[in-house]
């Protein structure tokens, strides 16, 4: 459910939301670290109704949720990290 991507693309998020989404309605979370053409960290949430939203990384709820997911994944499977080579 938690994915970290390193990409050479520019920022993916045009606008960000702080609105709470309970984990039960989240399909997966994609984290795009700052850099490689985008000056800010981005968090993209895929919801179970097939819609996608960019979430403000400063939103308290997403920070809490990612902490829970990190703890959970460290006790089971490692968080998948997908690295794209920068040309």
């Amino acid at each position: 459910v938690l994915e970290v991507y390193y990409t050479s693309l520019r920022c993916r998020c045009v606008q960000e939301s702080s609105v709470f989404i309970p984990r039960r309605f989240i399909d997966r979370i994609q984290i795009l670290p700052r850099g490689n053409g985008c000056p800010r960290k981005e968090i993209i949430v895929w919801k179970k109704n097939k819609s996608i939203v960019c979430v403000d990384p400063q939103a308290e709820w997403i920070q809490r949720m990612m902490e829970v997911l990190r703890k959970r994944s460290s006790s089971t499977l490692p968080v998948p990290v997908f690295k794209r080579k920068i040309p």
């Epitope: 709470f20 309970p22 984990r23 039960r24 179970k48 109704n49 819609s51 089971t76």
Partner: antibody
């Protein structure tokens, strides 16, 4: 005091449609997501639909997806369930329930429920 | 989809008895389980959420425990008003209710 009052149930033929309503009071309706849960006669509880506090997001289980539509009117403190292409297996008491607090970050489940309205699908 | 297997489906007990109901999830649901009480002709009432957190006003004789896939709901000393049907609900991944446990007077 939180109150949820369902209405709109009744007898409908297979293939027919029905619209259920739920009037909410005693809390800030626009701050909470809302859900519908049903219970077939003598059976257990089954989740039917959930809508976010602002009404922009809706979620359904596969067995009602495409047939049922949940909606809300925050100005009227009202929740709705439009049910189309009804089948005999949709016969149940339908409850509306208050769901998570949308302005927070707590993973709370449905806490307050109405008394339900009976929907009977039969020819 | 997550399946919730609740057992037993029915249970006979006496006032003062200690009663335990279990729910097993088909996959890890962390601690995202709730327990409801339902009396005939009435709406379900939330007793416990997040495995063990009691709702305000719910007597302390009700308790819950577990994590991952195995969860337990306990009534430490049955009171006459406790005879009802109890349901578990997982809310880690959408919603799934257990099949219910009907608690009857012996």
């Amino acid at each position: 005091e939180v109150q949820l009052v369902e209405s709109g149930g009744g007898l409908v033929q297979p293939g027919g449609s029905l619209r259920l309503s739920c009037a909410a009071s005693g809390f800030t309706f626009s701050s909470y997501a809302m859900s519908w849960v049903r219970q077939a006669p003598g059976k257990g509880l089954e989740w039917v639909a959930t809508i976010s506090e602002g009404g922009s997001d809706a979620y359904y289980p596969d067995n009602v997806k495409g047939r049922f539509t949940i909606s809300r009117d925050n100005a009227k403190n009202s929740l709705y369930l439009q049910m189309n292409s009804l089948r005999a297996e949709d016969t149940a008491v339908y409850y509306c329930a208050r769901d998570y607090y949308g302005s927070g970050y707590e993973e709370s489940p449905m806490d307050y429920w109405g008394q339900g309205t009976l929907v009977t699908v039969s020819s | 989809d997550i399946q919730m297997t609740q057992s037993p489906s029915s249970l006979s007990a006496s006032v003062g008895d200690r009663v335990t109901i279990t729910c097993k999830a088909s996959q890890d649901i962390n601690k995202y389980i709730a327990w409801y009480q339902q009396k005939p002709g009435k709406a379900p009432k939330l007793l416990i959420h997040y495995t063990s957190t009691l709702q305000p006003g719910v007597p302390s004789r009700f308790s819950g425990s577990g994590s991952g896939t195995d969860f337990t709901f306990t009534i430490s000393s049955l009171q006459p008003e406790d005879f009802a049907t109890y349901y578990c609900l997982q809310y880690d991944n959408l919603y799934t209710f257990g099949g219910g446990t009907k608690l009857e007077i012996k």
